[in-house]
């Protein structure tokens, strides 16, 4: 008789999660000599562990402290790039200024980027089926609880000037709801960081509108202000231009306002 | 315990300049921003801006904007609130207080008051 | 700027009973909304903030609700030591903007 298995509303375990974790693991650690004392097979013996076995909506941030521990890296706290709704950009970015990070330039960002992943109760097994939705099904599923605890300790981390790229095409610039809104911002420490500068990605051509003034932004320069942190906004009017720019400074339409 | 403790009373003429001082003890200073708060006699409260205690740098609600200034004594964990070329619609009691906040939204709120500091404006 | 309208501007009650105060928002301001009580002489005491939170050590007998544009501030079962000024304040944009205060008496 087939097993009961629980159907949950989100998509299942990204196929060959196992040997991709693994195999980005020793990638990451070949080309970061940082971090080449890392050993990935116990990495992931410390990422499986924190959901297998486990109910896949009673996951906390003590499952992955284990995890976390292995994969403690040291960032340059003043050169953190975070970003809501608009990481490509943030990745082309970092991918040129090789100085800048986002959390997923890190070991442990980068070995759950775009992955999905959950156990079963009282199994071993992975569920590739199904895995639990963030507002369909519960909130403590082992990815949402892994974004929350990575980026908690990254913005934990930053300090001096901290950039956030954000979409300017989107109805909400500045959205509370996101991890940058729900966690990133509440975690970043006053006594570290003095600035927090908004870079406003804007989509359209001929948009020249001022989107720092946008409601939303309002609201983030609120947030930061109460946790005694200053903050400042730019428009990124062509993000093509801004991309050219940061490969090639010297270029002479990059006097100009982008 | 955490106090911000304000200077006494004022009374002064039109035209005068006066400096309030918030001394605040029993938590770090600089990790809190400090508001300014005025309430004119019978009246509400207005919101007059904050400082950072960490830079120093003033942020003021456009009413405020020109004769009022914020300033800090960091090594004596004092915030300063100066008032230039004072007029009679200045009457009022200024309050500071401090903006707590945590690592969730819900934490966030001007948590402790000094006592207020009453400034007469009168010729 | 984000104006607070702020009723009644006064209310007389009797001990043991419910009051409800309101503050209407100009803008929307998700659940930014803070709660306090000034008495005579003194400074205001902080009750509730963001997002409807009861402050540690103040009586379960003050509660708010509200999302948006509309909220509600309420005591239940009145004591004579709840006699003071009541404010909102909106925090969810700079100027931080107070509703006009409530008057709060016992007959």
């Known amino acids: 008789v087939p097993r009961w298995r629980q159907q949950w509303s989100g998509p299942g375990t990204t196929k060959r999660f196992p040997e991709t974790v693994l195999a980005r693991c020793v990638k990451y650690t070949e080309i970061h000599p940082e971090m080449r004392h890392v050993d990935c097979q116990s990495v992931w013996d410390a990422f499986k562990g924190a959901f297998i076995s486990k109910h896949p909506c009673n996951i906390t941030e003590e499952d992955y402290q284990p995890l976390m521990k292995l994969g403690t890296q040291t960032v340059p706290c003043n050169k953190i790039l975070l970003w809501s709704r608009i990481k490509d950009l943030a990745h082309q970015f970092t991918q040129v200024q090789r100085d800048m990070f986002t959390l997923e330039d890190t070991l442990l960002g980068y070995l759950a980027d775009d992955l999905t992943w959950c156990g079963e109760f009282n199994t071993s097994k992975i569920n590739y089926q199904s895995c639990p939705d963030w507002r369909k099904d519960c909130s403590n599923n082992p990815v949402s609880v892994f974004w929350k605890t990575v980026s908690r300790r990254f913005a934990e981390a930053a300090c001096d000037v901290v950039h956030v790229m954000l979409n300017g095409s989107r109805s909400k610039i500045f959205d509370k709801n996101s991890t940058f809104g729900s966690v990133e911002v509440h975690n970043l420490q006053p006594e570290k960081v003095q600035t927090l500068e908004a870079w406003v990605i804007h989509g359209g051509r001929e948009d020249s509108r001022d989107l720092c003034q946008d409601p939303t932004i309002k609201e983030l320069e609120s947030i930061i202000s109460k946790r005694n942190i200053q903050f400042s906004c730019k428009n990124i009017y062509r993000p093509d231009k801004f991309l050219q720019c940061v490969k090639n400074p010297e270029d002479s339409s990059c006097t100009s306002e982008i | 315990q955490i106090q911000l403790v304000q200077s006494g009373p004022e009374l002064k003429k039109p035209g005068e300049t006066v400096k309030i001082s918030c001394k605040a003890s029993?938590?770090?200073?600089?990790?809190?921003?400090m508001n300014w708060v005025k309430q004119a006699p019978g009246k509400g409260l207005k919101w007059m801006g904050w400082?950072?205690?960490?830079?120093?740098?003033?942020t003021y609600a456009e009413e405020f904007k020109g004769r009022f200034a914020f300033s800090l004594e960091t090594s004596a964990s004092t915030a300063y609130l100066q008032i230039n070329n004072l007029k009679n619609e200045d009457t009022a009691t200024y309050f500071c207080a401090r903006w707590y906040y945590g690592s969730t939204p819900s934490s966030y709120t001007m948590d402790y008051w000094g006592q207020g500091t009453s400034v007469t404006v009168s010729s | 700027e984000t104006t607070v309208t702020q009723s009644p501007a006064s209310l007389s009650v009797a001990t043991g009973e419910k009051v409800t105060i309101r503050c209407i928002t100009s803008t929307d301001i998700d659940d930014d909304m803070n709660w306090y009580q000034q008495k005579p002489g003194e400074p205001p005491k902080v009750l509730i903030s963001e997002g409807n939170t009861l402050r540690p050590g103040v009586p379960s007998r003050f509660s708010s609700s509200g999302y948006g544009t509309d909220f509600v501030f309420t005591i239940e079962n009145t004591l004579s030591e709840d006699v003071a000024d009541y404010y909102c304040l909106q925090s969810n944009n700079m100027p931080y903007t107070f509703g006009g205060g409530t008057k709060l008496e016992i007959k």
């Open positions: 400082i950072n205690t960490n830079t120093g740098e003033p």
């Open positions: 029993g938590y770090t200073f600089k990790k809190y921003g």
